[in-house]
Every structure is written in C-alpha cells, then in structure tokens.
C-alpha cells in the first residue's frame, strides 16, 4: 500500500492556482500574479540547466518571444513548441505576438505601431489559436492550428481566478497566466503596476507565478527612479508609450 499516514515533514513546497473551470466563480478574485521568480531558501530556485522553454501559446513566453516550433521542419518531432525570439521590424510574421514589442503583424510583415496596436494575445482578423486536444500539438507548418472565432462564440468567458488554457478563455480585461498548478485568468496590468520584462533569454522559465502583460497603450519599462539600481533589481512597471 502507499505510505501510511504522514507524521512529520518539513514545509515542502509545491503547487498553485485556483480553479473554477471556464465559468469560474464570480468574485473569485486572484491577485495580480506576484510574478515571483524562484528564489533562495528551500524554495525551488533556477532550473538546473536552462533548456528551451516549452510552451503552448504566446502568453507563456516573454514579451520579446512567441511560441512556435523551433523550425518549420521540426514540427513533426513530437509537435513540441518552444519560446522563440520575437521578429524584428520588416520580418515575416503570421500573428502579432511574433513581432517584437512596438510592432504588430500586418500583411505578414512586422510593422512599427505608434501605440500598443494589439496587446499580446489579441486577435488578428478574428482568428484565434486553437491547439486542439493536445497542448503541445503544432500544425505541419510549424505553427499552431488556427480557427475562426465562431468556434468560441458560445464559450463562457472565465472570470478572475478561473482555470484557463489561453487568454481567449478569459473575460475582457483578463489574460491567462501561469499560477503554477495551472493557468488562471488574471487582470491585465494597469498603468503603474509592476510587470515582468524578460531580459535574459529563458528567464521566463523560472516564472511560475506569472503576471499578465501590460494593457493597451502601455509598455513594460524600467521605473524612472530605479535607473540607478543594479541590473538585477531594476523594477519594471507598465507605463504610457
């Protein structure tokens, strides 16, 4: 039989979010995710060796990354997708999240946007990603399968705290962000709120309690009075463009 009853134990770590399925519970509020990175103590710290961060959707990646298969030809290898570096101005794209911050995808090319043209996860031409049943499945061309919005029309949007798979599962003003045990609907960040800027490739791999992205018209930038601070402690907040 499995262990008999446990008697003592040091506080061992592990787990996270709240639940609620797609519908959630009205009023089941969730904090704007602390965005805590693994730190010292007996808490998990960094991953032993950085490996490419697996993902199922763009929201799981840093603001300067998007989720796709490593190469167009690699899609067949288990259908695994990872976070890839965003595409700069004038590079080819299929959706907004592929373009670096300050750009958006227009006619298949990353173009500069004067304001935050499309917040991360927003829909281009009423098309959304649909990963189907397999979280990691990718279409044969190395990009997630896509389907028109009509397939989601009757889907109840998750309230704050509802478990979700992607931001389109959440109500307006919320994004789907990791909260360790699962991903939940959390508020999109407002002006002045602390945000996460992934400077080092792969740093998002440590972010178990993930923050949403900054709301429309806002960018995640170093807070002015923190310019003097050391690189590691610089505080980023959502600021007007």
């Amino acid at each position: 039989t499995l262990n008999s009853v446990l008697i003592n134990s040091n506080a061992i770590k592990n787990l996270p979010p709240p639940l609620g399925g797609a519908g959630g519970q009205p009023g089941s509020a969730v904090s704007v995710a602390p965005g805590v990175l693994y730190e010292g103590g007996n808490k998990y710290q960094t991953l032993d060796n950085y490996q490419p961060y697996p993902c199922a959707e763009d929201e799981e990646c840093g603001s300067d990354e998007y989720c796709s298969s490593p190469s167009r030809g690699a899609a067949g290898v288990g259908g695994v997708q990872i976070c890839l570096a965003c595409r700069k101005r004038r590079k080819r794209c299929m959706r907004h999240a592929m373009c670096c911050p300050g750009n958006y995808c227009k006619n298949g090319i990353c173009m500069p946007s004067d304001h935050s043209h499309f917040p991360r996860g927003e829909i281009e031409e009423s098309i959304i990603e649909n990963l189907g049943n397999d979280h990691n499945a990718a279409a044969g061309d190395g990009y997630p399968r896509r389907t028109t919005l009509t397939s989601k029309i009757y889907h109840t949007k998750g309230q704050e705290g509802s478990v979700c798979l992607r931001s389109s599962d959440c109500a307006a003003g919320l994004c789907c962000a990791r909260h360790f045990w699962s991903k939940i609907c959390k508020p999109v960040l407002k002006e002045g709120q602390v945000c996460t800027k992934h400077k080092r490739k792969g740093s998002h791999g440590l972010e178990i309690f993930q923050r949403c992205y900054c709301g429309e018209g806002l960018a995640c930038r170093i807070q002015k009075d923190h310019h003097q601070a050391s690189n590691s402690s610089r505080l980023h907040t959502c600021q007007r463009h």
Epitope: P18, S31, P34, G161, W181
Partner: antibody
C-alpha cells in the same frame, strides 16, 4: 524563508467538527492561494479546495462542498479549514499548500 | 478510483531506468492542462519533482524527467538509487469536475 506551519494533531468523535490552521510566514500572505489537500492512511492525495488569501474567495471540490469551510485571517496570515459532520473515513493527514510550498500536515483522527 | 490512472507499483534494480505512466482523458491532460509530478517519502509532505510536464526545479537531479503524449504523461527515472524508493503522484486539473486531480500514486521499489 517561506513557511507554512499547521496546528497539531486532533482526535474527534463522529459527527463533530474540526478546524485546522495554517500559519504562513516569509511572504506576502495576500498574494497567494492556499489549497487544502488530504491523505487518508495508506491512500493517495485528494484536493479539497482553495481560498484566495486576499479576497477570501473559495472554491471547494464537489465531494466536500456541503461540509467544508475555508477561511483566513489576513492580520495573522493564517488560513483555516473546517470540516464538519466528521466520519471515520475523514481520518487523514490534512495539508495546506501555498501552491509551491506545503505545510507539514495535521493528522485528524475520527474515532468513537 | 482516481481520475488520473497510475500503476500501483513499479520496481527496478539500482542503476536501471523505470517509467511511471499517468493516464488521463480529454477533460484533463488531453485538454492541455499541465501535469506535475511529486515524490512522497514516508512520513513527509509531497515534494515537487517535475512541473508543467517536463520542467525540473533546482535541486532535483536530471535523472528525473517528464514527458507528455496526448492524454497521458510519464515520469522517467534513470540510474535508480535506493533513496528513490517512495510514492510518486501525478497531478493535473479536470475541467469536467472543475477540480484539481491527483493520480492514485505509484509505489516505487528499488530492488536490492
């Protein structure tokens, strides 16, 4: 250092209620959920529900919906799980979890 | 019976490789909800081994690895050691139950 310290073992009679506490320290209590998970002797883990420490919003597993009440006191950074109408098969180790940390467990024995 | 199905026991000699399966359905693992793996040594709270299918917290040796295929997940342990003897649980979320769910647990025996 993040710690979740639970109250001591309890022995209860069938039909009674038990209230287990979980005192958090080393982090901002109101930023996280507290989950409760139980484990009967020789059995697996069973999720009971969660409370959001800031808002007090709760979600309970259907099995416990009618008997469990989760609450918190933000001033003392403590979460509580009360289980009523106890039966002998509620004898288990009850864990609180901050999602990435677990308490040491509280053994609740229900016996006449 | 658990929503996530694990073999009750597996065994292997020191140095060998063992795998523990966790079979779910289209409402949990197959729907794309994360799978996490825990190790529970006798008399202790569960300890996280793998999160989000295949990520290892620091301090967890690379002998432990996780993978996912369709509605199933697997935990592989290579270079088996006597101190790996423990119970192992998978965990996910089930949208039909609106609940977090655990596998029934697998007891790993390291043969001497």
């Amino acid at each position: 250092e993040v710690q979740l310290v639970q109250s001591g073992a309890e022995v209860k009679k069938p039909g009674a209620s038990v209230k287990v506490s979980c005192k958090a320290s080393g982090y901002t209590f109101t930023d996280y959920y507290i989950h409760w998970v139980r484990q009967a002797p020789g059995q697996g883990l069973e999720w009971m529900g969660w409370i959001h420490s800031n808002s007090g919003a709760t979600t309970y597993a259907q099995k416990f919906q009618a008997r469990v009440t989760m609450s918190r006191d933000t001033s003392s950074s403590t979460a509580y799980m009360e289980l009523s109408r106890l039966e002998s098969d509620d004898t288990a180790m009850y864990f609180c979890s901050r999602e990435d940390y677990w308490g040491q467990g509280t053994l609740v024995t229900v016996s006449s | 019976q658990s929503v996530l199905t694990q073999p009750p026991s597996v065994s292997g000699a020191p140095g060998q490789r063992v795998t523990i399966s966790c079979t779910g359905s289209s409402s949990n693992i197959g729907a794309g909800y994360d799978v996490h793996w825990y190790q529970q040594l006798p008399g202790t709270a569960p300890k996280l081994l793998i999160y989000g299918y295949s990520n290892r917290p620091s301090g967890v040796p690379d002998r432990f690895s996780g993978s996912k295929s369709g509605a199933s997940a697997s935990l592989a342990i290579t270079g088996l050691r006597p101190d790996d003897e423990a119970d192992y649980y998978c965990q996910s979320y089930d949208n039909s139950l609106s609940s977090y769910v655990f596998g029934g647990g697998t007891q790993l025996t390291v043969l001497s």
